[in-house]
């Protein structure tokens, strides 16, 4: 073509795959009449006529572009729709008059690759490999042109390094003309790379400029020999009986060796294997003082045929023994004195406290409690608490009952009970003393006795309310070797309709309908008089 050598560089038109390329014929009016133009595509230096413009009217030539070309901008621009990678070529327009001139356009096509897909080598890498081993593979699909790949380790780009880092990239052309890039990172890794984060980055161009896409970060399994095994105990700090204690074996190698945990038998000094759970953890629950001792872990690395032993670990499960109180069952006369002594063993220093059982009041800090000039009220429960102050929750207790000799002592002297005739009444009477009294009733009925504590007894009587009973009332008598005492229950008839809810004169009332021989549970609904009770 005359004058082709001195032709300027073609105009660059950049478009993304799938969009429309606007090819504007840049011939000036002096160079040619735009109403009479031929358009060619140039591929491998071969020109193919693809479109004709005559008197401003366009006509596609048969072939690959037939359906995708149209004229725009009053005939000066050729629009190519649905651009594909195969469209990346030179297009030229040639004016026919006054003389043949042409204008060249270089069409550049771009397509962003998909998100890079990274796959780590699932088999892992030994640290002492002689040459770089496959770490991960990065695949970037359907990009155009071929994107560039950069590999990163812990955020830093990796460069080719002889015998250390090798990046092997290859690409395939899809039927669409798009490229799929595959890049394999091979590297020699060290133990410190066990936590290293690797990712790949695809760099590509679009008409809008340079862009990049990053893969997710991955870590590769790194295998390195075990050099040390050790024991770890949880929880850390002071252990006590009842705790859940976990003893686990750990190693600095990957994969870890096969572990066994053993405890030294103090008498034979032999290591005896302890049964671990599926995770190789020895669980002591609840921990007992017998679990104290010397533990060690053996790791068998069958890959290198090396057995490794941990440093032994002394485990101390702190305890407090059963608490002993002497005297164990003290009996004293009123006015006398009593010394209670508390003893216990522990793996740590103990603190003792004496408390009154009924009130929880602290009476003494120390193992000895002295009681002088004993009154009847001093009888009852005393609790010794032996505790280890340095280990919260580690304590044992013992209750001792102090008995003061004396005749029966009644819970009340007199009581009024409101009743209905023919109802079955449930009456109760309580007495205390040492020796423990027994209770008898002055009327026939079903009586049952219940020991409340070593000095106290409760008797209940089921009796039918009769006119005679209303007249005489009911007496309960408590007696022991040292005497007897009586309580009286006065029975009074009540009219349910006249009874006011705030009446304070009733002492025992059944709200169930009282029909002949109906059993009424008077104890559950009993309302006590506010009057002070005399105590025999």
């Amino acid at each position: 073509v005359p004058g082709e050598a001195e032709q300027p560089a073609p105009e660059l038109v950049e478009v993304e795959v799938g969009s429309t390329a606007l090819l504007k014929c840049g011939l000036s009016q002096s160079q040619g009449n735009l109403s009479h133009v031929d358009w060619f595509s140039v591929h491998k230096e071969k020109r193919t006529l693809i479109f004709r413009v005559r008197q401003g009217q366009g006509q596609s030539e048969p072939g690959e572009y037939e359906q995708r070309l149209s004229l725009q901008d009053r005939g000066a621009t050729l629009a190519l729709t649905q651009v594909t990678p195969q469209d990346e070529r030179i297009f030229l327009c040639q004016g026919k008059r006054p003389r043949s001139q042409e204008y060249r356009i270089q069409l550049r096509v771009y397509k962003a690759p998909e998100e890079p897909n990274i796959q780590v080598n699932p088999l892992g890498i030994p640290v002492n490999s002689k040459e770089p081993e496959e770490v991960a593979t990065c695949v970037g699909r359907n990009g155009y042109p071929i994107p560039q790949v950069i590999w990163y380790k812990n955020g830093r780009p990796l460069k080719e390094e002889k015998n250390r880092v090798h990046i092997q990239s290859s690409q395939t052309v899809e039927s669409s003309g798009l490229y799929t890039l595959q890049s394999i990172l091979k590297a020699q890794l060290v133990k410190e790379d066990k936590d290293a984060q690797f990712y790949c980055e695809l760099n590509y161009r679009l008409p809008s400029g340079n862009h990049m896409k990053e893969s997710r970060e991955v870590t590769v399994p790194v295998f390195y020999p075990t050099e040390k095994v050790w024991l770890e105990v949880e929880p850390v700090g002071m252990l006590k009986e009842g705790d859940r204690v976990e003893i686990r074996c750990l190693a600095d190698g990957n994969p870890p060796p096969h572990f066994s945990i053993s405890k030294q038998n103090p008498s034979t000094r032999e290591a005896e294997e302890e049964t671990t759970n599926d995770n190789g953890v020895l669980v002591l629950e609840p921990a007992r003082k017998e679990h104290s001792g010397r533990y060690e872990c053996q790791g068998l690395d069958l890959d290198t045929m090396i057995s490794l032993l941990s440093e032994p670990q002394e485990l101390l499960v702190n305890y407090v023994s059963d608490v002993r109180v002497s005297p164990a069952a003290p009996e004293r006369q009123e006015g006398s004195s009593l010394t209670l002594t508390c003893e216990a063993e522990s793996s740590q220093d103990l603190e003792f406290q004496w408390l009154r059982e009924e009130t929880g009041q602290v009476l003494e800090r120390g193992p000895v409690l002295q009681l002088h000039d004993l009154k009847r009220e001093a009888g009852g429960g005393y609790r010794c608490v032996a505790s280890v102050p340095s280990i919260p929750g580690l304590n044992r207790t013992q209750l001792v009952n102090v008995a003061i000799f004396g005749p029966p002592w009644m819970a009340f002297k007199e009581r009024k009970v409101w009743v209905k005739e023919n109802m079955v009444l449930n009456l109760s009477c309580e007495a205390s003393g040492h020796p423990r009294p027994t209770i008898s009733w002055n009327v026939n009925g079903t009586a049952s006795e219940q020991d409340q504590d070593p000095q106290r007894v409760l008797s209940t009587l089921n009796v039918l309310v009769t006119p005679e009973l209303l007249e005489t009332g009911v007496e309960c008598t408590a007696s022991n070797d040292l005497g007897k005492n009586t309580s009286i229950l006065f029975l009074e008839l009540v009219n349910l309709t006249t009874l006011t809810p705030d009446s304070n004169t009733t002492t025992g009332l059944s709200t169930s309908t009282a029909s002949p021989h109906t059993r009424a549970n008077s104890t559950s609904t009993e309302r006590k008089l506010p009057e002070p009770e005399s105590r025999g």
Partner: antibody
């Protein structure tokens, strides 16, 4: 017949390195661990380290870590031990041995290494 | 580290005699899960490489004459040669593999 054939005696200068080889025959090389042992003149035996020819994993006596490097070439059924920064203390006979049940059932004939200026 | 102590350091016996040599470890070599003692005995004849005689404290290696017997457990082990032969002249080493590998100092057996 199972054999472990080691290289001949070595005379090396202080500070230099030496690489001893141990060629295995008569059994599947990758099925057994290879161990290395040092015997100083008139002295007892000292374990240096082990290597698994199949996985390439190795383990060392901490005393020899950094002094000895164990490698294998599966294609030639050969185990290697490189000793570096040699001093007169490293003068000894070095043995390779095949591992079985945490014992050493076959031994090479030994390689004498003399470090002298 | 586990220390292996062998005694006596040397002994001289006549052919046909019974001989015992002792090996003590600074801690038990009995693996609690396998119930095996991680101890082996080796024989090293003058100018030769060591040879495995006994492993797991009492298992005789194939091809080893039955006059060689290993016994013991935990920390105390014994190698017994029931009737010493002239070819038994050697240094005998015990070795533990319970925690890495360590050899004893050896017992030198001489024939009178």
């Amino acid at each position: 017949e199972i054999q472990l054939q080691q290289t001949g005696p070595e005379l090396v200068k202080p500070g230099a390195s030496v690489k001893i080889s141990c060629k295995a025959s008569g059994y599947s090389f990758t099925d057994y661990i290879m161990l290395w042992v040092k015997q100083s003149h008139g002295k007892s035996l000292e374990w240096i380290g082990n290597i698994n020819p199949y996985s390439g994993s190795s383990g060392y006596n901490l005393k020899f870590k950094g002094k000895a490097t164990l490698t294998v070439d599966k294609s030639s059924s050969t185990a290697y031990m490189q000793l570096n920064s040699l001093t007169s203390e490293d003068s000894a006979v070095y043995y390779c041995a095949r591992g079985k049940d945490f014992a050493m059932d076959y031994w090479g004939q030994g390689t004498s290494v003399t470090v002298s200026s | 580290d586990i220390v292996m102590s062998q005694s006596p350091s040397s002994l001289a016996v006549s052919a046909g005699e019974k001989v015992t040599m002792s090996c003590k470890s600074s801690q038990s070599l009995l693996n609690s899960s396998t119930r095996k003692n991680f101890l082996a005995w080796y024989q090293q004849k003058p100018g030769q490489s060591p040879k495995l005689l006994i492993y797991w404290a009492s298992t005789r290696e194939s091809g080893v004459p039955d006059r060689f017997t290993g016994s013991g457990s935990g920390t105390d082990f014994t190698l017994t040669i029931s009737s010493v032969q002239a070819e038994d002249l050697a240094v005998y080493y015990c070795k533990q593999s319970y925690n890495r590998y360590t050899f004893g100092g050896g017992t030198k057996l001489e024939i009178k």
